[in-house]
Amino acid sequence: EVEKTACPSGKKAREIDESLIFYKKWELEACVDAALLATQMDRVNAIPFTYEQLDVLKHKLDELYPQGYPESVIQHLGYLFLKMSPEDIRKWNVTSLETLKALLEVNKGHEMSPQVATLIDRFVKGRGQLDKDTLDTLTAFYPGYLCSLSPEELSSVPPSSIWAVRPQDLDTCDPRQLDVLYPKARLAFQNMNGSEYFVKIQSFLGGAPTEDLKALSQQNVSMDLATFMKLRTDAVLPLTVAEVQKLLGPHVEGLKAEERHRPVRDWILRQRQDDLDTLGLGLQG
């Protein structure tokens, strides 16, 4: 805390400008009106304040808005956002996607901090669901965002938002998350034709049940081995040799290189040797 001291004569700030960088901490406290600061927050970012000076400015805003900052101030926080604690952010009510983008921009290139995680949580809860625009924004800044959500949180993602998801956004998702996302993707892409549908659904297939894989095997999709290896074990095991051959198409030869890995290893064990031999790959059950 900065002590309350009278502002020296002639030092009272009329506006937020570069002259303030020469003010000592106590002078900033005494000479900068909090209401002026709040209305001219957009100027703060252009001024090279020290971290100590930013602490004073934050303190002034905290005093002015003990219940939490209004969105008009939040949108222009800029680097002052980095001074906020998750406890501060929990008091906010952020509803504008532009505000969210402005604050995410400040943290760009860094890991998701507890502050950013709290901000996103507040924003999404305020909206009630992860709509497409929000998901688009979040995955642009944090490709792993979707996979950082629990299956329960993912259940609030509407199928329409799935169109915003890129394959790399699902890289770190685990099977429980894909179990939630796959039915949404299936719904979202249901009106697409065979080959286009497969291109879109491919990243989500780690959540697909056996019957959907059987259906895909009838559509000449030529699934690559990387996708096959991410399928659920319980979905792969009931597939016949013929179905796997149709599902993989020319990629079926890749099974040999994966024969010691799950789920291929367990699938091989379940097959009759005569059936495996029809593949001509030397797979041993």
């Epitope: 685990d174 099977p175 429980r176 290896m229 991410k230 074990t233 319980d234 095991l237 010691r260 890995h261 799950r262 290893r265 367990d266 064990l269 379940r270 041993q284 059950g285």
Partner: antibody
């Protein structure tokens, strides 16, 4: 529910063959969803997987032990067995049999049996 | 063979603490990662399978996360019965390797 019980000698002489049997009760070794494994733990050390067998007779062994290990299954007795040849003091350990469910992991274990290799 | 590296090898914690153990695979193992708990003189017990799925009967304070090469076991609020050694294990590759273990002791 399924239970596993190891049996076999607790003392084996160096250069001889260690033989253990695991009896499965409350379930079947012929389950299509399960592999039957042997795992060991030297005193004060971590876990080392030895190998598994499927009801069909297919086996898979730890590469570091492969030349000395044989695992077999007897579906009529609902048992599977481990043979480890040319043992040395380094093979002294608690030996566990375990069920490896292909959807989960080693979900059921025997209580373990201590085998000491000493002359 | 795939190597599994656990850290830390031991840790001291108090009842109520949040405890995190990490496991790193020498190559990608997708989500094929299991966690076991072992108490002295007892057989290991399966806690988490497929990186994040809780085994039936295991308290919800245990959770797992991760995919590819980096995985985490978290105990949200350590209980007296949780003091034990924890092992990760990969069933992805046929070499079925275990991590070296993490001993959780009372502070």
């Amino acid at each position: 529910q399924v239970q596993l019980q190891e049996s076999g000698p607790g003392l084996v002489k160096p250069s001889e063959t260690l033989s253990l049997t695991c009896t499965v009760s409350g379930g079947s070794v012929s389950s299509r969803d399960d592999l039957w494994s042997w795992i060991r733990q030297p005193p004060g050390k971590g876990l080392e997987w030895i190998g598994y067998i499927y009801y069909s007779g297919s086996t898979n062994y730890n590469p570091s032990l492969k030349s000395r290990v044989t695992i077999s299954v007897d579906t009529s007795k609902n048992q599977f067995s481990l043979k480890l040849s040319s043992v040395t003091a380094a093979d002294t350990a608690v030996y566990y049999c375990a069920r490896d469910n292909v959807f989960t992991g080693f979900d059921i274990w025997g209580q373990g049996t201590m085998v000491t290799v000493s002359s | 063979d795939i190597q599994m590296t656990q850290s830390p090898s031991s840790l001291s914690a108090s009842v109520g603490d949040r405890v995190t153990i990490t496991c790193r695979a020498s190559q990608s193992i997708s989500s094929y990662l299991n966690w076991y708990q072992q108490k002295p003189g007892k057989a290991p017990k399966l806690l988490i399978y497929a990186a994040s799925s809780l085994q039936s009967g295991v308290p919800s304070r245990f959770s797992g996360s991760g995919s590819g090469t980096d995985f985490t076991l978290t105990i949200s609020s350590l209980q007296p019965e949780d003091f034990a050694t924890y092992y990760c294990q990969q069933p992805y590759d046929a070499s079925y390797t275990f991590g070296g273990g993490t001993k959780v002791e009372i502070k």
